[in-house]
């Protein structure tokens, strides 16, 4: 079951998933000037059996200028620099990932992929929050959000995190102990997360839903 809305926005914070539940989809998005190859899948899908999970399909991008070719275009110096940054980040993300049954790791980057990754999360997915550079984390409980199914609808739990002040950035789970507290949080206003929304509003009783597409920005 796909989660219908996006994880909560926390001011001056970004989120990431340490691992992706089976059923998660990742759009095959290409950077400007490139497009998905004609025979290519529109998304990667986290699938698996009892012992192993992996991403089905591979994303491939080709130059929009190229007509009937699937040849990978050599990136220009600017693009190479951008791609290297993405690779480095991906490797860093993989380094702190544990192998969870029924979960896939962060997929490695593909040639000429877009700078934003658009994930479609499923019920049971957990995402973790950290404050952006220059903001300090005030924990009032777990700095995480879980997609749950209740009331016939999906929702994300509220992460117990506030990002404040000018100081060192906080860390992801395992690198800092949050202080637990039962208090709730006020609604957050803005976020550096890039999100695109695709509204599918149904106002009938049993289906008052909104569908959002999730995007996390590479920092």
């Amino acid at each position: 079951e796909l989660c219908d809305d996006d994880p909560p926005k926390i001011t001056h914070a970004t989120f990431k998933a340490v691992a992706y539940k089976e059923g998660t989809m990742l759009n095959c998005e290409c950077k400007r000037g490139f497009r998905r190859i004609k025979s290519g899948s529109p998304y990667m899908l986290c699938t698996g059996n009892s012992s192993h999970s992996s991403w089905d399909n591979q994303c491939q991008c080709t130059s929009s200028a190229a007509r009937n070719t699937t040849k990978q275009v050599t990136p220009q110096p600017e693009e190479q620099k951008e791609r290297k940054t993405t690779e480095m980040q991906s490797q860093m993300q993989l380094a702190d990932q544990v192998s969870l049954p029924g979960h896939c790791r962060e997929p490695p980057p593909w040639e000429n992929e877009a700078t934003e990754r658009i994930y479609h999360f499923v019920v049971g997915q957990t995402v973790y929050y950290q404050c952006v550079q220059g903001y300090r984390a005030l924990h009032r409980g777990p700095a995480e959000s879980v997609c749950k199914m209740t009331h016939g609808k999906t929702r994300w739990t509220q992460p117990q995190l506030i990002c404040t002040g000018e100081t060192e950035p906080s860390q992801f789970p395992g690198e800092e102990e949050p202080q637990a507290s039962p208090d709730g949080l006020p609604e957050s206003e803005t976020s550096r997360l890039v999100t695109t929304t695709d509204f599918r509003i149904q106002t009938e009783v049993a289906a008052t839903m909104e569908t959002f597409i999730f995007t996390t920005e590479y920092q």
Partner: antibody, heavy 120, light 107 residues
Framework: QVQLQQSGPGLVKPSQTLSLTCAVS??????????WNWIRQSPSRGLEWLGR?????????DYAVSVKSRISINLDTSKDQFSLQLNPVTPEDTAVYYC??????????WGQGTLVTVSS | EIVMTQSPATLSVSPGERATLSCRAS??????LAWYQQKPGQAPRLLIY???TRATGIPARFSGSGSGTEFTLTISSLQSEDFAVYFC?????????FGQGTRLEIK
Amino acid sequence: QVQLQQSGPGLVKPSQTLSLTCAVSGDRVSNINAAWNWIRQSPSRGLEWLGRTYYRSKWYNDYAVSVKSRISINLDTSKDQFSLQLNPVTPEDTAVYYCARDPWEAFDYWGQGTLVTVSS
Amino acid sequence: EIVMTQSPATLSVSPGERATLSCRASQSVSSNLAWYQQKPGQAPRLLIYAASTRATGIPARFSGSGSGTEFTLTISSLQSEDFAVYFCQQYNDWSITFGQGTRLEIK
């Protein structure tokens, strides 16, 4: 501390409109992490959920099938109030009516309850 | 709609003893189940949500268990203030439903 304070008449004539209001303090009705509900309780029906209103970038209402054609839940965000209208009513609508907050888990805060008698 | 059935309708237990109340759903409600306590003239009070999580301020003698269609509320050592009516409620479906209640009385 969240509090829900109910108000409204305790006696309504058959075929007329039952109207109750629930004033919220300690929270906002526009809180995206909660839904605002009406529930009633009678010896014959037990506890019966009637409907909810909630905000998810716009306002939504969900109504129980048993009362869908007769119920309306409205909001006054400036006063942090929500209200119940049930029209028309019959003696079978005689019950104690409660408003309650639901943070998408269970009803954690309830109003004090209002006994509404439908009788001519 | 999901029908919630509680048993027994009335349970007689002596103070200090353990009370076990059951709730069955007509179809799976996952762990989306709550328990309430109600005393005469009062609104229901939330005891347990998510099948097994105690609400704020609820004593540790109250515990919930189960998932899917079978659920249990256990009161480990009954206090005089625990004698009341107990309701289960599912919130898995968009249309919320309650059980008919179990009256817990002093034996």
